[in-house]
């Protein structure tokens, strides 16, 4: 289920546990607002259940720049994927331009 | 394992204060939000407040608003709750209660006390 | 605040029967809602939350169903253990958490 911020702050538990990189579905950061006047973050596990984890805990902390680095690197994958099919699309253009000039 | 010990009940006048403490051990307290929870005679179960693990934010029944304050001590784990300006209709056992779930929807009351009789009378 | 009601106040079977408690908001709680168990002079304790999840150490004949504004709390075959008195409390929309009035299940 998606969070619900009924204008207070979501979290009133933290995770105790260990969240492995691998578990995660979606990590959401929320930044103090009118609302909620600290940081929080939310994790959704590839399960579907959501979680609440500790911002001032160096785990925390460490997850949190694995799962950015994790982000960025499959937006560069995507990125590079319709780079490609930009590349293969304009070597046909190209094909059927001179197909064109040669008929 | 868990355990939950209420602590401070008896008897009160109305109008006086007491304070309750709830004792946890067995899991970690600091990540955990808690509850008071109160019970008449014979009646059932009342919500009375609750504190999220970092105490940042504090929320009340309305029939105690403004005279009951939650309140917790992480390095001792320790909840508490002072209970001013009591009246008859507060009298009742109260549970403090561990917060199952992280944002207040999801889980329920997972571990209880065993509860602590307060009885307001003159 | 939302209400809930409990039905029946009491209910009265014998050990090995199907018990079947209702419980029903006054406004929709989604699927957040917990059933409580509580004994004469204990704490309560957890039975279902999320409406249809089993807490820790639950025996599989207690189940819990709904959403929206009705949810059921079963008991496939009753154990003696299990005559006691059961709460609903929703969570959707809180401060208060409201609990229902309770459902005495007696032994017949």
């Known amino acids: 289920t998606p969070v619900v911020r009924k204008g207070r702050c979501s979290c009133i538990s933290t995770n105790q546990g260990t969240i492995h990189l691998q578990s995660l579905k979606d990590l959401k950061q929320f930044a103090p607002s009118p609302s909620c006047e600290k940081i929080e973050i939310i994790a959704t596990l590839k399960n579907g259940v959501q979680t609440c984890l500790n911002p001032d805990s160096a785990d925390v902390k460490e997850l949190i720049k694995k799962w950015e680095k994790q982000v960025s690197q499959k937006k560069k994958q995507k990125n590079g994927k319709k780079h490609q099919k930009k590349k293969v699309l304009k070597v046909r253009k190209s094909q059927r331009s001179r197909q064109k000039k040669t008929t | 394992q868990v355990q939950l010990v209420e602590s401070g009940g008896g008897v009160v006048q109305p109008g006086r204060s007491l304070r309750l403490s709830c004792a946890a051990s067995?899991?970690?307290?600091?990540?955990?939000?808690m509850h008071w929870v109160r019970q008449a005679p014979g009646k059932g179960l009342e919500w009375v407040a609750l504190?999220?693990?970092?105490?940042?934010?504090?929320y009340y029944a309305d029939s105690v608003k403004g005279r009951f304050t939650i309140s917790r001590d992480n390095s001792k784990n320790t909840l508490y709750l002072q209970m001013n300006s009591l009246r008859a209709e507060d009298t009742a056992v109260y549970y403090c209660?561990?917060?199952?779930?992280?944002?207040?929807?999801?889980?329920?009351?997972?571990?209880w006390g065993q509860g602590i009789l307060v009885t307001v009378s003159s | 605040e939302i209400v809930l009601t409990q039905s029946p106040a009491t209910l009265s079977l014998s050990p090995g029967e199907r018990a079947t408690l209702s419980c029903r908001a006054s406004?929709?709680?989604?699927?957040?809602l917990a059933w409580y168990q509580q004994k004469p002079g204990q704490a309560p304790r957890l039975l279902i939350y999320?409406?249809?999840n089993r807490a820790t150490g639950i025996p599989a004949r207690f189940s819990g169903s709904g959403s929206g504004t009705d949810f059921t709390l079963t008991i496939s075959s009753l154990e003696p253990e299990d005559f006691a008195v059961y709460y609903c409390?929703?969570?959707?929309?809180?401060?208060?958490?409201?609990f229902g009035q309770g459902t005495k299940l007696e032994i017949k």
């Open positions: 209660a561990r917060e199952g779930g992280y944002t207040g929807y999801d889980g329920g009351f997972d571990y």
């Open positions: 504190i999220p693990f970092d105490g940042y934010n504090k």
């Open positions: 999320d409406a249809s």
């Open positions: 409390q929703q969570r959707s929309n809180w401060p208060p958490y409201t």
């Open positions: 406004q929709s709680v989604s699927s957040y």
């Open positions: 067995g899991f970690t307290f600091s990540n955990s939000a």
